[in-house]
């Protein structure tokens, strides 16, 4: 076999099939694969921000001058293979991915760097990096171990337009609460003070200013 | 069953272009695991290798014919076309259309061949 | 660009002979190399890649070997419906070449 040093787990992914079962993963096993092994680096563990998104490098050891590379990115859960991306690129020209796909990357001589969006806790796995070169020839395959990203669900914010209203209602409430307050202070000082009540005020003489206490005008009742 | 099937073929002028088409049944030409490809054999000789090409429309082609071919790809109608520009009686041959593995440069399914003469 | 060369160019043998073809790489090539096998008026058909690996569908008597620059298609057994011409081809860098065929004649 060509494939020397292809270690078993590489050769249960030779293919780029969408979904492999388990039983298909088995027979896989058993299929020789003439390619040249390659080296593939990748992290063992990726936290996703909290927007879903998740980030890692890829890096693979080139054997040769590669013109075109295929990077794939499989997810591994629950014995079950699945393609996440792919994208072909030329060195030294950007990963071009298909439009609907939740990935984007760019590359950087032996280095791609591999941005996955739009993750929720049940994408929780482990994400595999598959670098391919195919020209010029001969092809070689490499299969990195994997990066465990994790993804944590934020906690459920409430709609925007509820918090609106909310905030609308408790500034509502506050406003009508001071103005009623308001009314009713001045409503009870009008009712302390008479309205046919007189009086007159009286300046008392300024006082000395080493006196300490001042004496301003006051209201003199008058009966 | 995989089936390649090349059209086209017929009498060519000197200078003129030549278009085949291959149309493959008995499978998806858009499968990301396979190239497909053309080979030519001149009459009594051996075989030449003119050009790859995947579904995604990534061509390679022999170093010695690049500046006179174009091979390109409609998945929608399942075919690949080949287009051989400024032909000279050398350019004679029975033209194929084949089919690779990825992992392999070497071609496992074979379309019958059509025969291109270049004649005035 | 690497050369092929197959010998020899033609050969004769009696059904039931072992019959052993050669080709040759002018630089090395791994193991890189496929065998085709070509019947009069016929398309060519994948006997062996990777030097060595029978091509599914493929009668056993038909094997390769070698590395490098030197590789062999052996026939253990020759048949009358073996009688065609087999090229042998090189895939490790581009641009892909064929040998010259070795045309496979029964006496």
């Known amino acids: 076999m060509a494939c020397l040093g292809f270690q078993r787990h590489k050769a249960q992914l030779n293919l780029a099939t969408r979904t492999w079962p388990c039983t298909l993963l088995f027979f896989l096993l058993f299929i020789p694969v003439f390619c040249k092994a390659m080296h593939v680096a990748q992290p063992a563990v990726v936290l996703a921000s909290s927007r879903g998104i998740a980030s890692f490098v890829c890096e693979y050891a080139s054997p040769g001058k590669a013109t075109e590379v295929r990077v794939t990115v499989l997810r591994q859960a629950d014995s079950q293979v699945t393609e996440v991306c792919a994208a072909t690129y030329m060195m030294g020209n950007e990963l071009t991915f298909l439009d609907d796909s939740i990935c984007t990357g760019t590359s950087s001589g032996n280095q791609v760097n591999l941005t996955i969006q739009g993750l929720r806790a049940m994408d929780t796995g482990l994400y595999i990096c598959k670098v391919e070169l195919m020209y010029p020839p001969p092809y070689y395959l490499g299969i990195g171990n994997g990066t465990q990203i994790y993804v944590i669900d934020p906690e459920p914010c409430p709609d925007s337009d509820f918090l609106l209203w909310i905030l609308a209602a408790v500034s509502s409430g506050l406003f009508f609460y001071s103005f009623l307050l308001t009314a009713v202070s001045l409503s009870k000082m009008l009712k302390k003070r008479s309205p046919l009540t007189t009086g007159v005020y009286v300046k008392m003489p300024p006082t000395e200013p080493e006196c300490e206490k001042q004496f301003q005008p006051y209201f003199i009742p008058i009966n | 069953q995989l089936q390649l099937q090349e059209s086209g073929g017929g009498v060519v002028r000197p200078g003129g272009s030549l278009r085949l088409s291959c149309t493959v049944s008995?499978?998806?030409?858009?499968?990301?695991?396979?190239?497909w490809g053309w080979i030519r054999q001149p009459p009594g000789k051996g075989l030449e290798w003119i050009g790859n090409?995947?579904?995604?429309?990534?061509?390679y082609y022999n170093p010695s014919l690049k500046s006179r071919v174009t091979i390109s790809v409609d998945t929608s109608k399942n075919q690949f076309s080949l287009k051989l520009s400024s032909v000279t009686a050398a350019d004679t041959a029975v033209y194929y259309c084949?089919?690779?593995?990825?992992?392999?440069?070497?071609?496992?399914?074979w379309g019958q061949g059509t025969l291109v003469t270049v004649s005035s | 660009d690497i050369q092929m060369t197959q010998s020899p160019s033609s050969l004769s043998a009696s059904v039931g002979d072992r019959v052993t073809i050669t080709c040759r790489a002018s630089?090395?090539?791994?193991?890189?190399l496929a065998w085709y096998q070509q019947k009069p008026g016929k398309v060519p058909k994948l006997l062996i890649y990777?030097?060595?690996t029978l091509q599914s569908g493929v009668p056993s008597r038909f094997s390769g070997s070698g590395s490098g620059t030197d590789f062999t298609l052996t026939i253990s057994s020759l048949q009358p419906e073996d009688v065609a011409t087999y090229y042998c081809?090189?895939?490790?860098?581009?641009?892909?070449?064929f040998g010259g065929g070795t045309k496979v004649e029964i006496k």
């Open positions: 084949a089919r690779r593995r990825i992992q392999l440069w070497s071609f496992d399914y």
């Open positions: 990777a030097a060595s």
């Open positions: 630089q090395g090539i791994s193991n890189y």
């Open positions: 008995g499978g998806s030409i858009s499968s990301s695991s396979y190239y």
């Open positions: 081809q090189k895939y490790n860098s581009a641009p892909l070449t």
């Open positions: 090409i995947y579904y995604s429309g990534n061509t």
